[in-house]
Every structure is written in C-alpha cells, then in structure tokens.
C-alpha cells in the first residue's frame, strides 16, 4: 500500500506594518503542536504594498481597499484556502499614523476606520487595526530578535545555529530605524531605569527581563530630514539652501508648504519670503553631521545619563541589532560587514557625500532618484544617532549589528506583536500548566 | 518625468521568437507593476500578462502562458516580454504600461510609445 | 474568463454634448467592497490612457468631465460636456481577476 502523506499541521498569521512610508504585509507560520516552542515561527512571505503609506490617503480614504488588494491577495494565494478562516490579521500603524493623529484624531481615526472595513472583506481572521505606541514598537522589536536569535531558549548550546549568536542567553539590545521615528530598546546592566516610561517588565519562558525602550518620534530618517531643512531654511539668506548633506551637483526645489506639513518641523516654523526653495548639493559630511547635531538638544538632562531631549537613556550594555531603516541604509552603502570599524564607515561615507551627483546617478542607474538623493544624509544621520544621541563609541560600534533577517524572518515589531497576540509567548517553560491571558506579554 | 521606452519595430518569420524591451525612467519598477498589452491592426485591446519586478511573480492570461515570458531587469529598470513560436497572428502593438499609486496617493498611469511585430513569411 | 460587452458599438454626438457608455461583465467584478472596472480612452496611434480605475476614481490629470459609475456588472462612463479632444475610442477593463480583460470598446465620434 501506498503511503499517503498526512497533512501538514501548520497554523498561519498574518501581520501589516503600515509605516510612514510604505505599509508591508508579513505572513507567518508555525507547526500547530509547536505553539510555545520557542523559535518555531517563520516567516514564509513579505509583501510590500506598491505606494505611499496609510496616512498619505488620507484625503481619499475610500482609496484604501484598492492599495490593499494586490497584497491581501497574495496573502489568498499563499495561504491554504483550508487555513484561511482560522488566519488571523493584525494591522499594525506606527509613526506616521501618530503624526496624523496629533493633527487631527478625526482624520485619523477616518483612515484606520476604512482599514478596518477593507481587511474584514477577505476570507481571513480580522482581529483589528490600530496605532500601536512607540514603546510598544521598540517592545516588539526586541522580542522579535531575540526570539529569533534563540535568546528565550533555555537549553544551551555548544553550537551556533543562528549568526551573531553568542552561547550565553543576554539578549540583543534592539535598534530600529523607520522614516518617521526610531526605537532604541536594551535590558541595562543592573541600572535602576530612571524614567518609568522607559521602563518595560517581561517574563517570558521563566525568566524575568527589565526593558529600557524610548522611541523618539520625528526623528526617523524622512522626518530627520524635514526637521534639518526646516532649521536651516531659517538662517538661509535668499530661496537657495546650499546643503552639504547631498551630492554635489544636485538640485530639487521644495514647497515650503511641503516643508511645514509636519508636526515635526512646527518648531522650526517662520514666515519666509518665498514659497519654494531649492536645495543645491555641497556634499560635505563634516557639515552635514554638524547640522543634524543640531537636531538633538544635549543641554538639558534631568537624569543620571540622557540620549537626547532631556529623554533617559542608561549606559549601553551588550550586542544590538540594527534593523529596518539603519540595515536597508547601511546595505545599499556596503557598510554592514562587521569587520568594517567605525571610523572605516566615517570615511566611506565622507568620500560617498563628496561625490558628484551626476557619478552617483550613473553609478546606481537602477535606484529611483528620490531615494538615491537621500542616502548621503540618511548614512551621515544613522552614525550622527548611533554616536552623538546614543552615545556609542569607535569601540561599542562593532557590538552593533546590521541585521535584515534572521533565519529568514524580517528584524522588526510585527513577529513579536503576532507572537503577543497570539498568546505564543509564554510567560512560564512550556511545560508548565497553561495559563491565563494575563501571563503573557 | 517618467518615461516608458520600447524597442523598436521586428519583422519575424512564423516559428522563430522576438525580446521586447521597455526601459523605464525616472520612475523604480520595484515600486509598481509592468503590464503587457498587444493591439492587433484595427482591433482591440489584449491583456497579455503582468510582473512584479519586485519578486518577479508574474501573471498571464492563459492563452500567452507558455509561449510568452515576462522579466524585470531592475538594475536597468527594464522590463521584456519574449514571444517564442510566432505564429501570424502575433502581429500587432505590444506596449507596456505601469499603473498604481505613487509617493502622494496619486493613481499614474504610464505607458510605452509601442513595439510593432510583424510576423510574415 | 469574464466577458465584457460595450454599447453601443458607435455613438456620433456633437460638441457640449453628453456621452454615456456602458460596459456589461459576464459576472460580477465586484470583491472585498470594490468594483474592479477600468476606463481607457485611446486615440489613433497613440497608447491607451487610463481615465477611471476602480469604477468611479479618476485617473491623474483626467479632467473632471469624465465620470464613471457602476457596480456588480454594469458600469457607465460619462462625459460631459464633450470637448473636441473627447473624440476617441473607449475601452472598459475588468482587473478583478486573471486575465484581465478589456472590452470591445466603444467608438465616441464628431456628428
């Protein structure tokens, strides 16, 4: 007799990051007699939805079904029609979404709305669409790392199955760039967190971790860049910004309306004498790390130890990964290997600044110019962060680690906030009696 | 401004193949999708089959699967639709079009000028 | 496949006039609360251009006298007041699902 295969036993979610500046759909899967196990889940698609972000509809929210579609279909295709029903959704909006709500909570609360309806047309389990907070997006992010990295895993190994893997359990501290805010989130070493509001408590798999999270919103690289040029707009003399953080060469002229759109250049915000401005290219790194410094105020701290902004921060213990925005950067500058030093990116990324637009244009046919422009700023931002306003130093730089996946699986929030949801966490061993829902996460 | 360039008229034989070309510019065709359409002489138009450059999935009406191939080069943003077997009524119009969403919500349409193929004996 | 059919075939109409085309699917092209109905207008050697997408939206910097309507399977475009450029052939799509399909078209002349 023939011997017919059983059919897997897989369970499947499915989690939209709707960033600033794209929203992307992750579908993951695990073996269904595996739940607590940890390391069990992986992700088996990413789909990046073609577009903006949620918040750009909102003038034309009824429009948001019709961005949705091509990747909830995907989603149709990829997962079991058997599974589908049992699947569940969770839409996830991040600093974008908190820009537009602290414009108007109407307008917000109008596009999230339609999500909502949208996703509850498909065949799937939708369990809701919200704003998720800055704390909760560094939280997440650092159980996704460590979770992938093995780091809950009680059982010590002699051997590495994952990279970055050291053999003892201290966690990864979690470093996460988008377009509108950035999360830095590590378990100090013995440090009293100051500031309740950094301070987050977990036990997960037995054992207790005291989490220090901040996540500072308009300072992601897109809103980072609004800011610097809507500060050095005001001291410009005429509607010509000569701007060292683009090549030289490069030109784009800039709605002042555009500029001031943003909660986060209102205080930056004057009445100037011109509509637009055009930004002219020096492509300068010494200058332009000078002015992004002067987006951090480092003059007042009420704690022991401060980033930025008078914002608690503890000594930096242990290794870090660096994800989302601070990998997709560093790769398309070639600077994530781990044997590149500190000073070796600085370098690399003063002869990167220096070179003339048109090179560059030529040298990287394939990248769409509105990004390629921005990298000289964006690279020159992440080490001005990482130095300046968190306080790494040439030799903490190698505990960093650029990471775009692990084991397959994207670094970032969505795999912790589906593996909270879904009660996948458990705050005990799994051998453990099971428990109730407020043991998790 | 976004351009769409095709490459320019063929003259095949029945049973041989062709490559068409469409080189975008000022727009990544990461960001959206690639379709193909064809438009016999004095006829309507005719879906062929789109690509993702983005993970190169593609999708075809059933009666191009097979003998027509759609690819993305996206270091070049070029994309190609091969037609092997030719046959008569190949000839016709093959244009490519991109249409979605771009940076501000806005829904663009783009379109390449057109590739005649001929296929005579 | 789903068929669309498009009436009527030739419609002759004068300037400042009201056109109104119709487009009939062979089944719904409705899905997750959205009409999959495309509107392209194509003038002789030129490439098609996309006027209406999703039934009712309008295409980028498509003049406000373009309309479209419709659900399930029947849809209408309408253009008015018709403008001299206006005079071209008219073709609905359905992108509901694979293949995508385009209709006949309806040719829009000067009487």
């Known amino acids: 007799t023939q011997n017919k295969a059983l059919p897997e036993n897989v369970k499947y979610g499915i989690v939209l990051d709707a960033g600033s500046s794209h929203t992307s759909l992750y579908i993951y899967k695990w073996p269904a007699e595996k739940e607590n196990d940890t390391g069990v889940v992986h992700q088996v698609e990413e789909c990046r939805v073609k577009g903006p972000g949620i918040s750009k509809f909102v003038q034309k929210v009824n429009e948001i079904g019709i961005y949705l579609t091509d990747c909830m279909e995907r989603a149709r295709e990829v997962i079991p029609r058997s599974q589908h029903q049992e699947t569940p959704v969770y839409l996830g909006a991040t600093a974008g979404m908190r820009l537009l709500r602290m414009e108007s909570e109407e307008l917000a609360d109008r596009v999230l709305d339609v999500v909502e309806r949208s996703l509850s047309n498909y065949p799937f389990d939708f369990q809701g669409a919200r704003i998720i907070t800055g704390q909760e997006e560094g939280a997440y992010g650092w159980i996704t790392i460590n979770y992938l990295l093995g780091k809950f895993s009680q059982k010590t190994r002699w051997f590495s199955i994952v990279p970055y893997e050291t053999n003892n359990q201290e966690t990864f501290g979690a470093l996460d760039l988008g377009g509108a805010s950035t999360q830095v989130t590590f378990v100090p070493q013995n440090q009293t967190i100051e500031s309740p509001d950094n301070a987050l408590q977990f036990r997960l798999y037995g054992k207790d971790y005291n989490v220090y999270t901040h996540s500072f919103l308009c300072y992601g690289k897109d809103q980072a860049l609004w800011q610097k040029l809507a500060k050095d707009i005001q001291v410009a003399s005429n509607e010509i910004l000569r701007d060292p953080c683009f090549h030289p060469g490069y030109k784009k002229v800039v709605n002042v309306s555009d500029l001031y759109k943003t909660p986060c250049t209102k205080r930056f915000e004057m009445t100037l004498p011109f509509q637009q401005f055009e930004i002219q290219g020096i492509g300068n790194y010494q200058q332009c790390h000078q002015s992004i410094l002067e987006l951090f105020n480092t003059s007042y701290c009420p704690y022991s130890q401060c980033a930025f902004n008078g914002i608690f921060l503890p000594p930096l213990q242990g290794d870090f990964g660096a994800f989302s925005a601070f990998y997709f950067v560093m790769k398309f500058l070639n600077l994530t290997s781990e044997k590149v030093s500190q000073e070796k990116v600085t370098e690399m990324m003063k002869k990167f600044c220096a070179q003339p637009w048109e090179e560059i244009k030529t040298s990287y046919a394939g990248v769409k110019e509105k990004y390629l422009s921005e990298y000289c700023f964006s690279g020159t931002y992440i080490l001005s962060l990482l130095l300046q306003g968190y306080h790494f130093t040439a030799d903490s730089w190698e505990h960093i680690h650029f990471i775009g996946k692990i084991q397959g699986s994207d670094a970032g929030w969505t795999l912790g906030y589906m593996l909270n949801l879904t009660n996948m966490i458990p705050a005990e061993q799994p051998l453990s009696t099971p428990l109730s829902h407020s043991t998790y996460v | 401004q976004v351009q769409l360039q095709q490459s320019g008229a063929e003259l095949k034989k029945p049973g041989a193949s062709v490559k068409i070309s469409c080189k975008v510019s000022?727009?990544?065709?990461?960001?959206?999708?690639v379709h193909w359409v064809r438009q016999p002489p004095g006829k309507g138009l005719e879906w062929i089959g789109k690509?993702?450059?983005?993970?190169?999935?593609?999708k075809f009406d059933p009666k191009f699967q097979g003998r027509f191939t759609i690819t993305a080069d996206t270091s070049t943003d070029t994309a190609y639709l091969e037609l092997s077997s030719l046959r008569s009524e190949d000839t016709a119009v093959y244009y490519c079009?991109?249409?979605?969403?771009?940076?501000?919500?806005?829904?663009?349409?783009?379109w390449g000028q057109g590739t005649m193929l001929t296929v005579s004996s | 496949d789903i068929v669309l059919t498009q009436s009527p075939a030739t419609l002759s109409l004068s300037l400042g006039q009201r056109a109104t085309l119709s487009c009939r699917a062979s089944?719904?092209?409705?899905?997750?609360?959205?009409?999959?109905m495309n509107w392209f207008q194509q003038k002789p050697g030129q490439p098609p251009r996309l006027l209406i997408y999703?039934?009712?939206n309008q295409g980028s910097g498509i003049p406000a006298r373009f309309s479209g309507s419709g659900s399930g399977t029947d849809f209408t475009l309408n253009i008015t007041p018709l403008e001299s450029e206006d005079f071209a052939v008219y073709y609905c799509q359905q992108s509901k699902e694979v293949p995508y399909t385009f209709g006949p078209g309806t040719k829009l002349e000067l009487k």
């Open positions: 690509i993702d450059p983005a993970n190169v999935n593609t």
């Open positions: 079009a991109l249409y979605g969403y771009d940076d501000d919500a806005y829904y663009f349409d783009y």
């Open positions: 089944e719904s092209v409705d899905n997750y609360g959205i009409s999959f």
């Open positions: 999703a039934a009712s």
């Open positions: 000022g727009f990544s065709i990461k960001d959206t999708y």
